[in-house]
Protein backbone atom coordinates (compact mmCIF):
# COMPACT_ATOMS: atom_id res chain seq x y z
CA UNK A 1 0.00 0.00 0.00
CA UNK A 2 1.14 3.63 -0.77
CA UNK A 3 1.52 6.00 1.75
CA UNK A 4 -1.49 8.31 2.34
CA UNK A 5 -1.47 11.24 0.88
CA UNK A 6 -4.73 13.46 1.15
CA UNK A 7 -6.97 15.58 -1.10
CA UNK A 8 -7.36 19.24 -0.15
CA UNK A 9 -10.60 18.71 0.79
CA UNK A 10 -10.28 15.65 3.17
CA UNK A 11 -7.27 17.42 4.66
CA UNK A 12 -8.97 20.64 5.09
CA UNK A 13 -12.24 18.68 6.87
CA UNK A 14 -9.44 16.71 9.35
CA UNK A 15 -7.59 20.71 9.57
CA UNK A 16 -11.45 22.10 10.86
CA UNK A 17 -12.14 19.40 13.14
CA UNK A 18 -8.56 19.72 14.86
CA UNK A 19 -9.09 23.72 14.98
CA UNK A 20 -12.12 23.30 16.40
CA UNK A 21 -11.07 20.88 19.55
CA UNK A 22 -8.08 22.46 20.30
CA UNK A 23 -10.02 25.91 20.26
CA UNK A 24 -12.93 24.73 22.56
CA UNK A 25 -11.11 22.98 24.97
CA UNK A 26 -12.44 23.96 28.60
CA UNK A 27 -11.01 20.84 30.62
CA UNK A 28 -8.25 18.72 30.20
CA UNK A 29 -9.06 16.56 26.75
CA UNK A 30 -10.15 12.85 26.91
CA UNK A 31 -9.03 13.21 31.65
CA UNK A 32 -5.57 14.62 30.50
CA UNK A 33 -4.98 10.65 29.01
CA UNK A 34 -1.61 10.04 27.21
CA UNK A 35 -0.85 8.93 24.20
CA UNK A 36 2.39 7.99 22.28
CA UNK A 37 4.13 10.75 20.30
CA UNK A 38 5.05 10.36 17.23
CA UNK A 39 7.52 11.62 14.36
CA UNK A 40 4.52 13.05 12.08
CA UNK A 41 6.26 12.13 8.48
CA UNK A 42 5.41 9.94 5.31
CA UNK A 43 2.34 7.56 7.14
CA UNK A 44 1.46 10.12 9.61
CA UNK A 45 -2.21 9.76 9.63
CA UNK A 46 -2.17 6.30 9.53
CA UNK A 47 0.65 6.70 12.96
CA UNK A 48 -1.73 9.51 14.36
CA UNK A 49 -4.77 6.95 14.10
CA UNK A 50 -2.20 4.08 15.82
CA UNK A 51 -1.52 6.38 18.61
CA UNK A 52 -5.28 7.84 19.10
CA UNK A 53 -6.69 4.13 19.12
CA UNK A 54 -6.15 3.39 22.52
CA UNK A 55 -8.26 5.74 23.92
CA UNK A 56 -11.82 4.91 24.45
CA UNK A 57 -14.69 6.66 26.30
CA UNK A 58 -13.70 9.86 24.68
CA UNK A 59 -16.53 11.16 22.20
CA UNK A 60 -14.38 14.54 21.66
CA UNK A 61 -12.29 12.81 19.21
CA UNK A 62 -14.32 10.09 17.80
CA UNK A 63 -14.76 12.09 15.01
CA UNK A 64 -10.90 13.01 13.96
CA UNK A 65 -10.55 9.23 14.74
CA UNK A 66 -12.81 8.24 12.03
CA UNK A 67 -11.34 11.10 9.97
CA UNK A 68 -7.94 9.73 10.01
CA UNK A 69 -9.43 6.47 9.59
CA UNK A 70 -10.97 7.60 6.04
CA UNK A 71 -7.40 9.42 5.36
CA UNK A 72 -5.42 6.00 6.25
CA UNK A 73 -7.97 3.18 5.75
CA UNK A 74 -5.33 0.15 4.74
CA UNK A 75 -2.55 -0.24 7.25
CA UNK A 76 0.59 0.59 5.70
CA UNK A 77 3.06 -2.43 5.21
CA UNK A 78 6.21 -2.96 7.22
CA UNK A 79 8.34 -1.08 3.65
CA UNK A 80 6.57 2.20 4.09
CA UNK A 81 6.83 2.42 8.16
CA UNK A 82 9.94 3.83 9.34
CA UNK A 83 10.35 6.55 12.30
CA UNK A 84 7.40 7.47 12.95
CA UNK A 85 6.54 4.10 14.41
CA UNK A 86 9.41 4.54 17.38
CA UNK A 87 7.29 4.68 20.68
CA UNK A 88 9.17 6.10 23.04
CA UNK A 89 7.64 9.53 24.40
CA UNK A 90 4.07 9.95 25.76
CA UNK A 91 1.96 13.37 25.95
CA UNK A 92 -1.44 14.23 26.41
CA UNK A 93 -4.08 14.00 23.72
CA UNK A 94 -4.53 18.19 23.61
CA UNK A 95 -0.72 18.22 22.78
CA UNK A 96 -1.04 15.44 20.62
CA UNK A 97 -4.00 16.83 18.51
CA UNK A 98 -1.77 20.60 18.00
CA UNK A 99 1.46 18.53 16.77
CA UNK A 100 -1.02 16.85 14.52
CA UNK A 101 -3.01 19.81 13.00
CA UNK A 102 0.19 21.97 12.74
CA UNK A 103 1.83 19.33 10.39
CA UNK A 104 -1.47 19.30 8.75
CA UNK A 105 -1.30 22.76 8.30
CA UNK A 106 1.83 22.32 7.12
CA UNK A 107 1.12 19.89 4.47
CA UNK A 108 -1.79 21.83 3.43
CA UNK A 109 -0.14 25.00 2.83
CA UNK A 110 2.45 23.08 0.88
CA UNK A 111 0.25 22.17 -1.48
CA UNK A 112 1.71 18.42 -0.94
CA UNK A 113 -1.60 16.81 -0.88
CA UNK A 114 -1.82 16.21 -4.88
CA UNK B 1 -32.00 6.08 4.45
CA UNK B 2 -28.40 5.02 4.99
CA UNK B 3 -27.59 2.80 1.31
CA UNK B 4 -25.13 2.07 -1.65
CA UNK B 5 -26.46 0.70 -4.84
CA UNK B 6 -24.56 -0.73 -7.07
CA UNK B 7 -24.82 -0.50 -11.35
CA UNK B 8 -23.36 -1.75 -14.30
CA UNK B 9 -23.48 -5.65 -14.34
CA UNK B 10 -23.99 -7.64 -17.24
CA UNK B 11 -22.22 -10.09 -19.82
CA UNK B 12 -18.85 -9.05 -21.17
CA UNK B 13 -16.62 -11.03 -22.83
CA UNK B 14 -13.32 -11.83 -22.03
CA UNK B 15 -10.88 -9.38 -22.72
CA UNK B 16 -13.08 -6.68 -22.52
CA UNK B 17 -14.50 -3.62 -20.49
CA UNK B 18 -16.90 -2.81 -17.93
CA UNK B 19 -17.64 0.37 -15.35
CA UNK B 20 -19.22 -0.34 -12.35
CA UNK B 21 -21.02 2.62 -10.62
CA UNK B 22 -22.00 2.59 -6.95
CA UNK B 23 -24.31 5.90 -5.82
CA UNK B 24 -24.16 6.59 -2.05
CA UNK B 25 -27.34 8.24 0.24
CA UNK B 26 -27.67 9.37 3.66
CA UNK B 27 -24.39 9.68 4.55
CA UNK B 28 -21.24 12.46 4.01
CA UNK B 29 -19.77 10.32 1.13
CA UNK B 30 -16.67 12.65 0.69
CA UNK B 31 -16.06 11.78 4.47
CA UNK B 32 -15.41 8.17 4.06
CA UNK B 33 -12.92 5.73 2.34
CA UNK B 34 -14.58 2.91 0.08
CA UNK B 35 -14.05 -0.61 -1.05
CA UNK B 36 -14.91 -3.15 -3.61
CA UNK B 37 -15.71 -6.68 -2.72
CA UNK B 38 -16.61 -9.55 -4.83
CA UNK B 39 -18.05 -12.76 -4.52
CA UNK B 40 -17.95 -15.75 -7.32
CA UNK B 41 -21.09 -18.18 -7.56
CA UNK B 42 -21.29 -20.29 -4.36
CA UNK B 43 -17.84 -19.28 -3.13
CA UNK B 44 -16.60 -16.75 -0.44
CA UNK B 45 -15.43 -12.88 -0.14
CA UNK B 46 -12.38 -12.11 -1.60
CA UNK B 47 -11.89 -7.76 -1.10
CA UNK B 48 -11.13 -5.96 -4.89
CA UNK B 49 -9.98 -2.59 -3.96
CA UNK B 50 -10.34 0.67 -1.90
CA UNK B 51 -10.08 4.24 -1.71
CA UNK B 52 -9.64 6.57 0.52
CA UNK B 53 -11.18 9.82 1.57
CA UNK B 54 -8.41 11.27 -0.05
CA UNK B 55 -7.73 9.56 -3.21
CA UNK B 56 -5.35 6.92 -2.43
CA UNK B 57 -6.26 4.05 -4.08
CA UNK B 58 -5.16 0.20 -2.65
CA UNK B 59 -5.18 -3.16 -5.03
CA UNK B 60 -4.37 -6.98 -4.77
CA UNK B 61 -2.55 -8.10 -7.08
CA UNK B 62 -5.10 -10.19 -8.96
CA UNK B 63 -6.71 -7.00 -10.45
CA UNK B 64 -3.90 -4.50 -10.14
CA UNK B 65 -3.27 -3.02 -13.32
CA UNK B 66 -6.76 -3.94 -15.30
CA UNK B 67 -8.91 -2.49 -12.45
CA UNK B 68 -8.90 1.35 -11.26
CA UNK B 69 -11.37 2.34 -8.40
CA UNK B 70 -12.06 6.38 -8.68
CA UNK B 71 -14.63 8.50 -6.93
CA UNK B 72 -16.74 11.39 -7.68
CA UNK B 73 -17.77 13.25 -4.45
CA UNK B 74 -19.77 16.17 -6.01
CA UNK B 75 -22.49 13.17 -7.87
CA UNK B 76 -21.79 10.45 -4.23
CA UNK B 77 -20.67 8.36 -6.57
CA UNK B 78 -17.86 5.46 -6.76
CA UNK B 79 -16.66 3.61 -9.52
CA UNK B 80 -14.71 0.24 -10.78
CA UNK B 81 -13.50 0.29 -14.03
CA UNK B 82 -12.54 -3.15 -14.74
CA UNK B 83 -10.28 -4.04 -17.83
CA UNK B 84 -8.83 -7.39 -19.44
CA UNK B 85 -11.56 -9.04 -17.86
CA UNK B 86 -11.57 -13.06 -17.10
CA UNK B 87 -13.31 -15.60 -16.63
CA UNK B 88 -12.62 -16.08 -13.26
CA UNK B 89 -13.45 -12.25 -12.79
CA UNK B 90 -16.93 -13.74 -12.81
CA UNK B 91 -18.54 -12.61 -9.79
CA UNK B 92 -21.47 -10.19 -7.44
CA UNK B 93 -19.46 -6.65 -6.68
CA UNK B 94 -20.17 -5.21 -3.76
CA UNK B 95 -19.60 -1.67 -3.28
CA UNK B 96 -19.20 -1.32 1.16
CA UNK B 97 -18.22 1.96 3.26
CA UNK B 98 -14.50 1.16 4.36
CA UNK B 99 -14.28 2.51 7.87
CA UNK B 100 -10.58 1.36 7.92
CA UNK B 101 -8.43 -1.12 9.33
CA UNK B 102 -9.70 -0.75 12.88
CA UNK B 103 -13.18 -0.75 12.25
CA UNK B 104 -14.09 -3.11 8.93
CA UNK B 105 -16.59 -2.31 6.18
CA UNK B 106 -19.63 -1.15 7.72
CA UNK B 107 -22.28 -0.61 5.10
CA UNK B 108 -22.40 -2.45 1.84
CA UNK B 109 -24.68 -2.39 -1.21
CA UNK B 110 -26.93 -5.28 -3.03
CA UNK B 111 -24.33 -5.68 -5.10
CA UNK B 112 -24.51 -6.34 -8.95
CA UNK B 113 -23.39 -9.39 -10.81
CA UNK B 114 -20.54 -9.49 -13.33
CA UNK B 115 -20.57 -12.24 -15.94
CA UNK B 116 -16.93 -12.76 -17.86
CA UNK B 117 -18.39 -15.56 -20.98
CA UNK B 118 -17.96 -15.72 -24.26
CA UNK C 1 -0.88 -13.39 1.59
CA UNK C 2 -2.50 -13.91 4.96
CA UNK C 3 -4.84 -17.00 4.52
CA UNK C 4 -7.81 -17.27 7.58
CA UNK C 5 -9.34 -20.83 7.58
CA UNK C 6 -12.68 -21.13 9.31
CA UNK C 7 -14.28 -24.32 10.66
CA UNK C 8 -16.34 -25.68 10.59
CA UNK C 9 -17.36 -24.90 7.12
CA UNK C 10 -20.98 -25.76 7.73
CA UNK C 11 -22.57 -27.16 10.88
CA UNK C 12 -26.84 -27.69 12.16
CA UNK C 13 -28.16 -26.39 15.10
CA UNK C 14 -31.65 -25.76 16.64
CA UNK C 15 -32.99 -21.95 18.18
CA UNK C 16 -31.59 -21.76 21.49
CA UNK C 17 -28.12 -23.39 20.85
CA UNK C 18 -24.64 -22.06 21.58
CA UNK C 19 -22.72 -22.00 18.36
CA UNK C 20 -19.08 -21.01 18.21
CA UNK C 21 -17.09 -20.75 15.02
CA UNK C 22 -13.23 -20.17 14.93
CA UNK C 23 -11.60 -18.50 12.40
CA UNK C 24 -7.54 -19.14 12.34
CA UNK C 25 -4.86 -16.97 10.65
CA UNK C 26 -1.67 -18.51 8.88
CA UNK C 27 0.06 -15.52 11.34
CA UNK C 28 -0.45 -12.76 13.71
CA UNK C 29 -3.20 -10.21 13.05
CA UNK C 30 -2.20 -8.18 16.16
CA UNK C 31 -1.00 -4.44 15.72
CA UNK C 32 -0.15 -2.79 18.36
CA UNK C 33 -2.46 -4.51 21.03
CA UNK C 34 -5.68 -4.34 18.63
CA UNK C 35 -6.63 -7.93 16.73
CA UNK C 36 -7.29 -6.86 13.01
CA UNK C 37 -10.26 -9.32 12.34
CA UNK C 38 -13.87 -8.63 11.76
CA UNK C 39 -17.27 -10.85 11.56
CA UNK C 40 -19.90 -10.45 8.88
CA UNK C 41 -22.94 -12.15 8.75
CA UNK C 42 -24.56 -13.33 4.84
CA UNK C 43 -28.15 -14.48 4.22
CA UNK C 44 -28.71 -15.78 0.98
CA UNK C 45 -29.43 -13.35 -1.82
CA UNK C 46 -28.11 -10.77 0.45
CA UNK C 47 -25.17 -8.38 1.15
CA UNK C 48 -22.79 -9.27 3.96
CA UNK C 49 -23.47 -7.08 7.46
CA UNK C 50 -20.65 -6.34 10.34
CA UNK C 51 -21.20 -8.15 13.17
CA UNK C 52 -17.85 -7.69 15.28
CA UNK C 53 -15.27 -5.39 14.95
CA UNK C 54 -11.37 -5.72 16.11
CA UNK C 55 -12.32 -9.19 17.04
CA UNK C 56 -14.61 -8.57 20.17
CA UNK C 57 -16.30 -5.18 19.61
CA UNK C 58 -20.29 -5.56 18.43
CA UNK C 59 -20.87 -3.53 15.99
CA UNK C 60 -23.71 -0.75 16.49
CA UNK C 61 -27.41 -2.35 16.49
CA UNK C 62 -26.31 -6.13 16.06
CA UNK C 63 -27.65 -8.01 18.75
CA UNK C 64 -25.77 -8.59 22.19
CA UNK C 65 -26.15 -12.54 21.70
CA UNK C 66 -23.17 -12.14 19.31
CA UNK C 67 -19.80 -12.11 20.71
CA UNK C 68 -16.11 -12.02 19.33
CA UNK C 69 -12.93 -13.19 20.84
CA UNK C 70 -9.23 -14.10 20.37
CA UNK C 71 -6.00 -12.59 19.76
CA UNK C 72 -2.85 -13.44 17.60
CA UNK C 73 -3.72 -16.13 15.10
CA UNK C 74 -7.24 -17.96 16.84
CA UNK C 75 -10.27 -16.26 16.80
CA UNK C 76 -13.65 -17.00 17.47
CA UNK C 77 -17.18 -15.83 16.86
CA UNK C 78 -20.13 -16.89 19.39
CA UNK C 79 -23.86 -16.75 19.19
CA UNK C 80 -25.05 -17.70 22.79
CA UNK C 81 -28.50 -18.36 21.81
CA UNK C 82 -29.29 -18.89 17.93
CA UNK C 83 -32.35 -17.16 16.93
CA UNK C 84 -34.12 -18.20 13.34
CA UNK C 85 -32.80 -14.96 11.77
CA UNK C 86 -29.16 -15.99 12.58
CA UNK C 87 -29.33 -19.18 9.94
CA UNK C 88 -26.95 -17.57 7.81
CA UNK C 89 -22.98 -17.67 6.60
CA UNK C 90 -20.87 -16.52 8.29
CA UNK C 91 -16.87 -15.06 7.44
CA UNK C 92 -14.38 -13.45 9.21
CA UNK C 93 -11.61 -11.36 7.53
CA UNK C 94 -8.15 -9.49 8.75
CA UNK C 95 -7.48 -5.99 7.95
CA UNK C 96 -3.58 -6.27 9.13
CA UNK C 97 -2.06 -7.06 6.15
CA UNK C 98 -3.05 -5.83 2.36
CA UNK C 99 -4.87 -7.73 0.93
CA UNK C 100 -7.33 -8.12 3.17
CA UNK C 101 -8.32 -11.84 2.96
CA UNK C 102 -11.46 -13.47 4.40
CA UNK C 103 -12.21 -16.88 5.50
CA UNK C 104 -14.06 -19.55 3.35
CA UNK C 105 -17.22 -19.16 5.52
CA UNK C 106 -19.11 -21.13 7.96
CA UNK C 107 -22.98 -21.76 6.96
CA UNK C 108 -25.06 -22.38 9.67
CA UNK C 109 -28.05 -24.61 8.73
CA UNK C 110 -31.58 -25.20 10.69
CA UNK C 111 -31.05 -28.98 12.31
Known amino acids: SPNPVPSSSSLKELIEELVNITQNQKVPLCNGSMVWSLNLTSSMYCAALDSLISISNCSVIHRTKRMLSALCPHKPSAKHVSSEYVRDTKIEVAQFLKDLLRHSRIIFRNGSYN | EVQLVESGGGLVQPGGSLRLSCAASGFTFSSYAMSWVRQAPGKGLEWVASISSGDTTYYPDSVKGRFTISRDNAKNSLYLQMNSLRAEDTAVYYC????????????WGQGTLVTVSS | DIQMTQSPSSLSASVGDRVTITCKAS??????????VHWYQQKPGKAPKLLIYRASNLESGVPSRFSGSGSGTDFTLTISSLQPEDFATYYCQQSNEDPWTFGGGTKVEIK
Open chain 2, 96 to 107: ARNEGYYFGLTL
Open chain 3, 27 to 36: ESVDHFGWSL
